[in-house]
């Protein structure tokens, strides 16, 4: 049994997968901030988690996916105000009773130290200093991401 949040996440991810056959991104578009191999877009208004997910999708991007603690820290360094929370692309999967990223992978328990409960209708936010479980209906800011395409030197066979 999937929750409405899970269904929304799956639907949007599937529609993204159908439309992601586009040229690689070499530079961050206007308004996006480069952080290593990603482009990040920080909202200045608030939304519940599923609306935030949808907003990122309309921008051919996704809610932020965090690979490890190092990436978390670098992202948190871009957050100026201690009191502001931002949604990321992680929510609680009721069917699998685990934290699940919107790309379908599960949270490695060592990656993020989450404050709060792991339960139905819980979504993950980050602040300048911490990672929180919040009700997905809470209206806070959000972070979208686009992956930059690594520039590889093309190797041509001898002619």
């Amino acid at each position: 049994q999937k929750s409405s949040i899970e269904k929304c996440s799956v639907d949007i991810q599937q529609s993204r997968n159908k439309t992601t056959e586009r040229p690689g991104l070499l530079n961050c578009p206007i308004y996006w901030q480069q952080l290593r191999e990603k482009c990040l877009l920080f909202s200045h208004t608030v939304n519940p988690w599923n609306n935030s997910l949808a907003d990122c999708s309309t921008k051919e991007s996704s809610l932020l996916l965090i690979r490890d603690k190092d990436e978390l820290i670098h992202t948190q360094n871009l957050i100026r105000d201690k009191a502001i929370l931002f949604w990321i692309g992680l929510n609680f999967s009721l069917s699998e009773k685990n934290w699940k990223w919107i790309n379908g992978s599960f949270l490695n328990s060592n990656d993020l130290e989450i404050r709060g409960d792991a339960k139905e209708n819980s979504c993950i936010s980050i602040s300048q200093t911490s990672v929180y479980s919040e009700y997905c209906s809470t209206e806070i800011r959000w972070i979208c991401q686009k992956e930059l395409t690594p520039v590889r030197n093309k190797v041509y066979p001898d002619s």
Partner: antibody
Framework: QVQLQESGPGLVKPSETLSLTCTVS????????WTWIRQSPGKGLEWIGY???????NYNPSLKSRVTMSLDTSKNQFSLKLTSVTTADTAVYYC???????????????WGQGTMVTVSS | EIVLTQSPGTLSLSPGERATLSCRAS???????LAWYQQKPGQAPRLLIY???SRATGIPDRFSGSGSGTDFTLTISRLEPEDFAVYYC?????????FGGGTKVEIK
Amino acid sequence: QVQLQESGPGLVKPSETLSLTCTVSGGSIDYFYWTWIRQSPGKGLEWIGYIYHSGSTNYNPSLKSRVTMSLDTSKNQFSLKLTSVTTADTAVYYCARDGGIVGATNALDIWGQGTMVTVSS
Amino acid sequence: EIVLTQSPGTLSLSPGERATLSCRASQSVSSSYLAWYQQKPGQAPRLLIYGASSRATGIPDRFSGSGSGTDFTLTISRLEPEDFAVYYCQQYGSSPLTFGGGTKVEIK
């Protein structure tokens, strides 16, 4: 409600540097794109560039070699420097808040009243 | 850079009439990131429409925007005396941001 106010000299000599400051009152500088635009007499609008709260900038390529923008978050101010000015830089200079592409209002939603800068010897 | 061409250059109309202003882009405007501004003499531009069709805060519903890709339209359904001004379109989907040359709406 957020208001913007430009300040700086109204007369600059050719080859010198034009310096303007915009003071933001009634709101935070965070997560917006603080922009400079100019309008030459009787002409259209030209985007000069923006500075984000992190300090990252994006300049119009046509002016990039001469433009520097900076931010003083403690004073809620952002600034424009344009070097090696000529008479072609004579214009009304506006500062504005750009909501970018995310949020309730995108684009240039709040403007200062503008300040006329004349380049003349 | 994206060049925006506005037409007509001047529109002569009477109060109560409908005004239709056109903005054409030299290439597709990303995600309809197109805005319209109104400017009166001696004043800064004022945001009317963003995202091609969303009205900015406090803008009367007689102003409406439409279009996508390369062709955009600003419509003023019934001109009020305070609507006579210069109107600019602007794209903000790619850098550098660019403005159209403006359409002057004047009293006939």
